[in-house]
Structures are given as structure tokens and as C-alpha cells.
């Protein structure tokens, strides 16, 4: 059951995993969410009544029966993981404490403007979990507009305490504002020889490589496959870390693979969700429960829905025994992953999918489309939305994207002459415009966000975000897609796409049926030699064949280029402007989204 | 069942004013546009403007933009006319129409507009 | 403004007959053109949508057709019931426009 709510003066009695130090009793549940074992916790808040050193300390719980008992005492605060509920978890905390010392070891020191240049530094550092600032009002001179950027082996203070005049504050790396590079690649036959900060067990180096992105002190990693020589060290997962934030040393070794934690692309890639199933293996750690089940997948979902479980073992029923059913053990560790894996004994494993929630949904996989043709298929481009005006008559005005599901991205230039977001309706999980009927569900737009820098298409900031009245429910024909990493500034897309109901030709009308094409990107210097009297700058991105013939065009404006990488589609490009549509030597200019995401989080974020 | 019942006739002086209504029931209101047009004797129709009664968002022909003026009274679902300077050429059937999802599809019975000194 | 031009005027068909009025729009309204018909004494009543489609309830003996610039509205066999105005209007841009109408006699 999911118990949102604070208990105030109430604490949970035993159960103790583990004690660590949080700014607030809110911060201290969502630390209590991304343990892989706390159910409970129980925070105290400063308090006269309260003896000063344990002010500030979060208890990690844990329990059997998913409860425990409640005791009244001043100051407490207790409540309960977000495990046990279906919403979106997000780590990013942008809250700044006042007056308060988070304590960890100080690395580094320097002179900044504001806290907020201070939080800037840190979420741009590879060490920097938290921070304090000295405010110009502190007391010692020497110590004013002093940056203390700080880490410590769980993310978390080793304690806190009050300081006049002083502010600390999380890294925003889990917000998706770290301008640190995102490198996505696992270098095979490589051990990085740094020092080991954990070791953990995982069948593929995937989920070594996720479960790096998640530990606090992990910059990268080194994983032992199931064929590495020694036998003790066989799936093992070593995480790592160096004063500089990169390996020192690269050793070539066969059977070894290593990378980087995918800290700065966490919010376009998923990180917590370990979807796929082993075959021929079992993991190894605490029994749970033995259920029988159909099938590994059946195993799977008896996993996710026991808030306890952290993985599982299937294995297949022998012939026509217990009516086809297998034994489905449900498992948890001290760390979430396995004691031990071990091969060749027909076992099929897996994770629990609740972590899924704790990942960006836009990282979900969509269906597989249909190469060539020009109709799109349902479902293919679940993000795609149809803009419609009433005014004068209701028509198709614009494409767009979900992004999150209160706000769709689409182009500024979309509005002109719309004078209330009120005669707008979004329509999702749309195919055909024909599908539309009077009494078609909609979303009706609360807000229209236009950058406040735009004046018209050609010269740049042609991005608008609407917020809708309701929330959109994700399903399989509508769910968002992410935005690009700022860390992947430098990736070549080479799978764009850009769809959209627009004209297939200058003078012609709105499609029906949504519409693809494959459009190759085009570099900026080369779109500025076709477009001589304009200013094509890096906030716009050009795409189009040299021939012509493929192209956006009137109607397509404010949707979405969208690229692949990784298995994940990511939102490149706003359709914007070009001359003409689909002509020779005249590729369609975008808004290039990368640019703008700071902007995009500003607002979809403020509060 | 969609209804839009119009005021009733009205007889004015040149220079004088009139506001006409449109009550609405059977559908949402304030989730549609309520158009005004007109229909001098003997002749076609004409366009006179539009209003969003959810937002007060308003459209003019510009022949009609100083004189008249579009409101809606969301809480008893009723749109509003008012033409001002009115003169001999405003005597007509006066109607309001809501603009469906593809067209105007429900009209009102019309109101009789006369000027006549 | 968007001109809508209609003919004829006025016309005169028996009964049986099928019968063609035509609008012809001063710039491209794509398909945002209806048709209304118009009995004496009555308000306008909606015939045809987006230029082809018939509208709730009304008989299938009335069509349209045309993108564009040009459209028409067809009677196929025309019945006593069908003498009144007929008028198109295009809803493409404001100012909202009508044709001057068409005038449907039986002979």
C-alpha cells in the first residue's frame, strides 16, 4: 500500500538498517526510497527537546510485515518508502538549506558569486555530492562567498549541523542539469586498474554499468564475465573511482569489460530497471517466498509486485509436474544484488521491474516500427501530438511532443495570433486526424510557455512548452520521449526521423495519417552555406537531403526530429522553418533541443 | 438536446444601441464558439464575429469592430450582442450559431432588428 | 477578406431533376466550406461539412464536393421539400464568409 504522508511526533520502533544524515524528513524518505532494503523511516527534525547530535538523522528501516510499531516522540518524523507506490521517483532535490552544514569531506574551495553558482560547481564536479556556501553575511571574513564542494562514500552528509549565514544544497546531477559528458560506451577486453570502492555481483555488464550510475562514490567500473579465468572472480562487478574522475590506467584483458557511470545521462537512459531475463542462471541471496509460477515472466511480475523482492530464480516445471507450473523463488540481498550467479543449472533470473519507476518513462521501449513507407503505424511515435485550434473552425495547427506528462514541447511560432491557450486541444496517442471526432478526448492547455527571447522562426528561440489542464497517463500509444543529454552534445544521431500530418507538397492540405521520414542530419556549416541570408546558429539544427524529396513541411511545424541512440529515442530537434519544402540544397531547420534544456527544466520544474 | 433561444424583436431609433441574447443548453458552453451573423431582408448572410465564452476571446469583422461588442455569461450559458450607432442598413434577422466541431451546426431562431426613426 | 462567389443566383428544376450550385472561393480555403439551407422564415440549417461531408441527418440525396477554390453542392433528384436559399460559407479565416446564396424553385 503506498502511505504518502508524513507521520509527525511518531517514530517507527526497530527494524534499523541503517542511520544516515538528511536535511528534512522529505529528503529522507527519497533516500529511503533508492535503498535497496528501507521500507520505513524515521527522521528527526531539530528540536529543543531533542539532544543536538541527533538532530538531522534519518533511520533506515526494514520489516517483514512492511510495517512496524509506532511510538509518539517529539520531533519525530516517520513515514514510508515510495517503494510500495506506482508514480514516478525522482532523486533530484533542488531545495537549499539555510543556515544549515551539511558535513562531508571538503575537496574543494573556492570563491563564488551566489549558492546557486556554488550548486552550479557541484553538479558539474564528478566528485560533488553536496555542498556549503558561506553567505556574505558570515561572520568571518575570510570564509565569505566561500564554495565548499563536498563528497562522502553514501552521497550522504556524515552529519549535519546549524551555522548561521551558511546555505548547503544537493548536486543537481539527478535533475539532468550536469554539463559532465555522457559516455554511453563499454570498452571490452579492458579492466580499469583504480581502486575499488565496492564490488557487487551482476550477470551482464550492463547492469554493472547501471548499478555504477546509482552507487554515490562510482565513476566507473570494471565487470568479470562468466568466462573471466578466475572462478572466484566471475561476475563480479567492481566499482571505481580516481581523484581525477578517470581511470588512470587501462589494462587489456580478454573477458573483462569495463565503462563509465551513466550519472550525467541517467534521465535519458535507463538506470534502476533491469528488464532482461538470464537464462541458464541462478541467483543466489536471502530466500523471500517460493510461489509456483507459469512461466520466468509470471516470476517476474510475482517479483515486482512483492515490495521486498529484489530479484528472482524461475525454474521450469518438470515435465507435466504441479500443472506445468515452475518454482518461482523470490530473493533480496543487504545491496539489492545478488551473493552469487551461478551457470548451467537451468535456472532463468531476473530483477524486479518496481525499480522501473525510478528511471525517466521516455526510456521505455516502444514497438518496433516498420522500415520504409510513408504511413506511420499506431503506436509508433507515441510522443507525437496533434495541436488543434477551434478557431475558427477546429483543424490540425501544430505537432508536438510529450515530454512529461503535464507538458508537451512544440514551437513557438505555433501561436501566433492564438490569444488564449483555452481555444487550444492537445490530442494523444493519435494515428489518423479522421479518428478525431467531437467527442474524441482531449487535453486542454493550462498554460502556453513561449521563450521569451523568440520574435520569429528564422532567427532562433522558436520553442514553446504547453502546460495541459490534466495529467496524461501513460500507456503504449502515448508516453513521453526524453530529452538529449547535455553531455551528448557531441553524439552523431545518424537514425533521425521526422513526422508529422503536414503537406506533402507546398500547396497541398493536412494528411490524414501521420507521416515518417528518414532525414539525415546536416552539419551547421554546411545548412549556413544553403541558407545565406540567414544566422543558422548552434541553437538550430539542420537536417535534409541534398536532393530534396524527404522533408517537413506546413503542419509538421512544432514536431518532433527524433533520434535513436542506444535504443532510446530522444527529442533533437523542433521542426521550425526552411524554405520551401523538401527543395534541392534546402535542408528543414530545427530548434536543437540540446540547447534549450535548461530552459525546458526551468520551467517544467518550477514550482 | 443542443437549443440556442434568441431575445425577441427589437425596434430602434437611429443612433440607438441594442443588445440581443442567446441562451444555450444541451451542451457545454463554455467549450465552444458562439458565432454572430446576420441576414438583411432579401439578402445572403454576413459574418459578424465570434466569442470564446471559456476565455472571452473575441473576433471582429472589421465592418463591425468599433460598434459592436461580443460577451458571455458563463453562469447562466448566455451570449451577448451589442451593436451600437445603429442606422437604417442594421435592420435585419440577427442570429447566433454555435461552431460545432466541423461547422456552424445549431442556430438560433433569430432576432428581428428593425431601425426606423 | 476570402470572396465567396456563388451561382446561380436563383434556378428552377422539376422535381426528379438533379440539381448543381457551385462556389467558387477568391483564395484556397483548402476544405473549410459548408453549405446551409435556408427555408423562408427559418434560420439556416446545416447541409454539408468539409466540403463532402453530410451532416447528421440529412438525406443522402445532397452531396459536395471540391478543394480549394471550387466547390459544389448536388442535389441528385430533387424533391418539393427541398425549395429554399441555399448558402456556402467558408470557415478557412476570419472574417468568416458567405456566398451571396442561391435561390432553388421547383419548375
Known amino acids: 500500500e503506498c502511505v504518502t504522508q508524513l507521520l509527525k511526533d511518531t517514530c517507527f520502533e526497530g527494524g534499523d538498517i541503517t542511520t544516515v544524515f538528511t536535511p528534512s524528513a522529505k529528503y529522507c524518505q527519497v533516500v529511503c526510497t533508492y535503498h535497496p532494503r528501507c521500507l520505513l523511516f524515521t527522521f528527526t527534525a531539530e528540536s529543543p527537546s531533542e539532544d543536538p547530535t541527533r538532530w538531522f538523522t534519518c533511520v533506515l528501516k526494514d520489516s517483514v510485515t512492511e510495517t512496524l510499531p509506532r511510538v509518539n516522540r517529539t520531533a519525530a518524523i516517520s513515514g514510508y518508502s515510495f517503494k510500495q507506490c506506482s508514480h514516478q521517483i525522482s532523486a533530484c532535490n533542488k531545495d537549499i538549506y539555510v543556515d544549515l552544514d551539511m558535513k562531508g569531506i571538503n575537496y574543494n574551495s573556492s570563491v563564488a558569486k551566489s549558492a546557486q553558482e556554488c550548486q552550479e560547481r557541484c553538479t558539474d564536479d564528478v566528485h560533488c555530492h553536496f555542498f556549503t556556501y558561506a553567505t556574505r553575511q558570515f561572520p568571518s571574513l575570510e570564509h565569505r562567498n566561500i564554495c565548499l564542494l563536498k563528497h562522502t562514500q553514501t552521497g550522504t552528509p556524515t552529519r549535519i549541523t546549524k551555522l548561521d549565514k551558511v546555505v548547503s544544497g544537493f548536486s543537481l546531477k539527478s535533475c539532468a542539469l550536469s554539463n559532465l559528458a555522457c559516455i554511453r560506451d563499454i570498452f571490452p577486453n579492458t579492466v580499469f586498474a583504480d581502486s575499488n570502492i565496492d564490488s557487487v555481483m551482476a550477470p551482464d555488464a550492463f547492469v554493472c554499468g547501471r548499478i555504477c550510475t546509482h552507487h554515490p562514490g562510482c565513476l566507473f567500473f570494471t565487470f568479470f564475465s562468466q568466462e573471466w579465468p578466475k572462478e572466484s572472480q566471475r561476475n563480479l562487478c567492481l566499482l571505481k573511482t580516481s581523484e581525477s574522475g578517470l581511470p588512470s590506467t587501462r589494462i587489456k584483458k580478454s573477458k573483462a569489460l569495463s565503462g563509465f557511470s551513466l550519472q550525467s545521462c541517467r534521465h535519458s537512459i535507463p538506470v534502476f530497471c533491469h528488464s532482461s531475463f538470464y537464462h541458464d542462471t541462478d541467483f543466489l541471496g536471502e530466500e523471500l517466498d517460493i510461489v509456483a509460477a507459469k512461466s520466468h515472466e509470471a516470476c517476474q511480475k510475482l517479483c515486482t509486485n512483492a515490495v521486498r523482492c529484489q530479484f528472482f530464480t524461475y525454474t521450469p516445471a518438470q515435465a507435466s509436474c504441479n500443472e506445468g507450473k515452475g518454482k518461482c523463488y523470490l530473493k533480496l540481498s543487504s545491496n539489492g544484488s545478488p551473493t552469487k550467479i551461478l551457470h548451467g543449472r537451468g535456472g532463468i533470473s531476473g530483477y524486479t521491474l518496481r525499480l522501473c519507476k525510478m528511471d525517466n518513462e521516455c526510456t521505455t521501449k516502444i514497438k518496433p516500427r516498420i522500415v520504409g513507407g510513408t504511413a506511420s503505424v499506431r503506436g509508433e511515435w507515441p510522443w507525437q501530438v496533434t495541436l488543434h485550434t477551434t478557431s475558427p473552425t477546429q483543424r490540425h495547427l501544430c505537432g508536438g511532443s510529450i515530454i512529461g506528462n503535464q507538458w508537451i514541447l512544440t514551437a513557438a511560432h505555433c501561436f501566433y495570433g492564438v490569444e488564449s491557450p483555452k481555444i487550444l486541444r492537445v490530442y494523444s496517442g493519435i494515428l489518423n486526424q479522421s479518428e478525431i471526432k467531437e467527442d474524441t478526448s482531449f487535453f486542454g492547455v493550462q498554460e502556453i510557455i513561449i521563450h521569451d527571447q523568440y520574435k520569429m522562426a528564422e532567427s532562433g528561440y522558436d520553442i514553446a512548452l504547453l502546460k495541459l489542464e490534466t495529467t496524461v497517463n501513460y500507456t503504449d500509444s502515448q508516453r513521453p520521449i526524453c530529452l538529449p543529454s547535455k553531455g551528448d552534445r557531441n553524439v552523431i544521431y545518424t537514425d533521425c526521423w521526422v513526422t508529422g500530418w503536414g503537406y506533402r507538397k507546398l500547396r497541398d492540405k493536412i494528411q490524414n495519417t501521420l507521416q515518417k521520414a528518414k532525414i539525415p542530419l546536416v552539419t551547421n556549416e554546411e545548412c549556413q552555406k544553403r541558407y545565406r541570408g540567414h544566422k543558422i546558429t548552434h541553437k538550430m539544427i539542420c537536417a535534409g537531403y541534398r536532393e530534396g524529396g524527404k522533408d517537413a513541411c506546413k503542419g509538421d511545424s512544432g514536431g518532433p526530429l527524433s533520434c535513436k541512440h542506444n535504443e532510446v529515442w530522444h527529442l533533437v530537434g523542433i521542426t521550425s522553418w526552411g524554405e520551401g519544402c523538401a527543395q534541392r540544397e534546402r535542408p528543414g531547420v530545427y530548434t536543437n533541443v540540446v540547447e534549450y534544456v535548461d530552459w525546458i527544466l526551468e520551467k517544467t520544474q518550477a514550482v | 438536446q443542443v437549443q440556442l433561444v434568441q431575445s425577441g424583436s427589437e425596434l430602434k431609433k437611429p443612433g440607438a444601441s441594442v443588445k440581443l441574447s442567446c441562451k444555450a443548453s444541451g451542451y457545454t458552453f463554455t467549450r465552444y464558439w458562439m458565432h454572430w451573423v446576420r441576414q438583411a431582408p432579401g439578402q445572403g448572410l454576413e459574418w459578424i464575429g465570434n466569442i470564446y465564452p471559456d476565455s472571452d476571446s473575441t473576433n471582429y469583422d472589421e465592418k463591425f469592430r468599433t460598434r459592436v461588442t461580443l460577451t458571455a455569461d458563463t453562469s447562466t450559458s448566455t451570449a451577448y450582442m451589442e451593436l451600437s450607432s445603429l442606422r437604417s442598413e442594421d435592420t435585419a434577422v440577427y442570429y447566433c450559431?454555435?461552431?460545432?466541431?466541423?461547422?456552424?451546426?445549431?442556430w438560433g431562431q433569430g432576432t428581428t432588428v428593425t431601425v426606423s426613426s | 477578406d476570402i470572396v465567396m462567389t456563388q451561382s446561380p443566383s436563383s434556378l428552377s428544376a422539376s422535381v426528379g431533376d438533379r440539381v448543381t450550385i457551385t462556389c467558387k472561393a477568391s483564395e484556397n480555403v483548402v476544405t473549410y466550406v459548408s453549405w446551409f439551407q435556408q427555408k423562408p422564415g427559418q434560420a439556416p440549417k446545416l447541409l454539408i461539412y468539409?466540403?463532402?461531408n453530410r451532416y447528421t441527418g440529412v438525406p443522402d440525396r445532397f452531396s459536395g464536393s471540391g478543394s480549394g477554390t471550387d466547390f459544389t453542392l448536388t442535389i441528385s433528384s430533387l424533391q418539393a421539400e427541398d425549395v429554399a436559399d441555399y448558402h456556402c460559407g467558408q470557415s478557412y479565416s476570419y472574417p468568416l464568409t458567405f456566398g451571396q446564396g442561391t435561390k432553388l424553385e421547383i419548375k
Open positions: 468539409g466540403a463532402s
Open positions: 450559431t454555435r461552431m460545432g466541431f466541423y461547422a456552424m451546426d445549431y
